[in-house]
């Protein structure tokens, strides 16, 4: 009897109620491999989820998140609220990045500005809540006599721009 079931292809299940006949998966279910004794229920993309790919007899549905949310986890198992650039999501909602940190995406956490001096460089463009600092040539490269097309920006560590 087991051999009969192994002949059932993906998209079907081995129906014990019908003498091991391969029956098609019912609507809204699937079997991605052959020889299955049941079909799995299709995932439903509801609420904050929206359908990216419909279910078929051989593969599950795939979900995305509705506008204003983004996917987290394997196969978009959760949707997390988007924030604006320059913010991060906390338990109390979206909060502005603290001074000295930035976030250039709608998701994720605020990260510290790059410390240019650690690389022996100076700040070329100051950081903001939305953007990291841009490091320029090292102060030594800009000493009198060194060729430089642009004058050095006033060095402000770690990259503060007046708010």
């Amino acid at each position: 009897l087991q051999d009969l079931c192994s002949n059932c292809p993906a998209g079907t299940f081995c129906d014990n109620n019908r003498s091991q006949i391969c029956s098609p998966c019912p609507p809204n279910s699937f079997s991605s491999a052959g020889g299955q004794r049941t079909c799995d229920i299709c995932r439903q993309c509801k609420g904050v989820f929206k359908t990216r790919k419909e279910c078929s007899s051989t593969s599950n549905a795939e979900c995305d998140c509705i506008s204003g949310y983004h996917c987290l986890g394997a196969e978009c198992s959760m949707c997390e609220q988007d924030c604006k650039q320059g913010q991060e999501l906390t338990k109390k909602g979206c909060k502005d990045c603290c001074f000295g940190t930035f976030n250039d995406q709608k998701r994720g956490i605020c990260r510290p500005w790059t410390n240019c001096s650690l690389d022996g460089k100076s700040v070329l463009v100051n950081g903001t809540k939305e953007r990291d600092v841009v490091c320029g040539p090292s102060p030594a490269d800009l000493s009198p006599g060194a060729s430089s097309a642009t004058p050095p920006a006033p060095a402000r560590e770690p990259g503060h721009s007046p708010q």
């Epitope: 998209g11 609507p27 790919k53 419909e54 078929s56």
Partner: antibody, heavy 114, light 111 residues
Framework: RSLEESGGRLVTPGTPLTLTCTAS????????MQWVRQAPGKGLEYIGT??????VYYASWARGRFTISRPSSTTVDLKMTSLTTEDTATYFC??????????WGPGTLVTVSS | DVVMTQTPASVSEPVGGTVTIKCQAS??????LSWYQQKPGQRPKLLIY???NLASGVPSRFSGSRSGTEFTLTISDLECADAATYYC?????????????FGGGTEVEFK
């Protein structure tokens, strides 16, 4: 269990027309339902699908002029506007192209002629 | 939209022979492909679903395979009843690209 299309007839260019697909013996809203057409002597041409969840997908050429809806649990409609002679074809509704047991209706003939 | 390019447009083989029909997808549609047989004046009949799975009641002389974006329908031990037009269809249904498209069809006749 069967599907049957209705509403096909002779119309003049520019006339709107709605075709209906009616299911017997099963609930249409449990399945993905697609509309396909076939001009005389030509191949099959995909129009669009309404999924079991109510999402609607169209071939890009059909978007805007064709509208698929599910007015009840046993019927699916295809609304067509701005018909031209190029739309003359047999129109089929079919159940679940992605499943192992699809079902097709016999088709309904739409003739667009002046 | 996904474009399905089907070759050849027609083929003529003797009874007992083998016919190979190919469908090339314009992008990676994974295994979302079905093969249909249609005879004049009739509705299409499913032969193969999910690229390689034989539909219920279809003889094992019909088989399907996939290599990347190319799909193949093989009909071996041809019988007179196999004279028909064969179509592939991309069965992907989702928002990231438009599936549903059919190949142009292959007419199988006998020498």
């Amino acid at each position: 269990r069967s599907l049957e299309e209705s509403g096909g007839r002779l119309v003049t260019p520019g006339t709107p027309l709605t075709l209906t697909c009616t299911a017997s013996g099963f609930t249409i809203s449990s399945y993905h339902m697609q509309w396909v057409r076939q001009a005389p002597g030509k191949g099959l041409e995909y129009i669009g699908t309404i999924s079991s969840g109510g999402n609607v997908y169209y071939a890009s050429w059909a978007r805007g002029r064709f509208t698929i809806s599910r007015p009840s649990s046993t019927t699916v409609d295809l609304k067509m506007t701005s018909l031209t002679t190029e739309d003359t074809a047999t129109y089929f509704c079919a159940r679940d192209s992605g499943y192992s047991d699809p079902m097709w209706g016999p088709g309904t003939l739409v003739t667009v002629s002046s | 939209d996904v474009v399905m390019t089907q070759t050849p447009a027609s083929v003529s083989e003797p009874v007992g022979g083998t016919v190979t029909i190919k469908c090339q997808a314009s992008q990676n549609i994974r295994t979302y492909l079905s093969w249909y047989q249609q005879k004049p004046g009739q509705r299409p009949k499913l032969l193969i679903y999910a690229a390689a799975n034989l539909a219920s009641g279809v003889p094992s002389r019909f088989s399907g395979s996939r290599s990347g974006t190319e799909f193949t329908l093989t009909i071996s031990d041809l019988e007179c009843a196999d004279a028909a037009t064969y179509y592939c269809q991309c069965t992907y249904l989702g928002t990231d690209y438009v599936g549903g498209a059919f190949g142009g069809g292959t007419e199988v006749e006998f020498k």
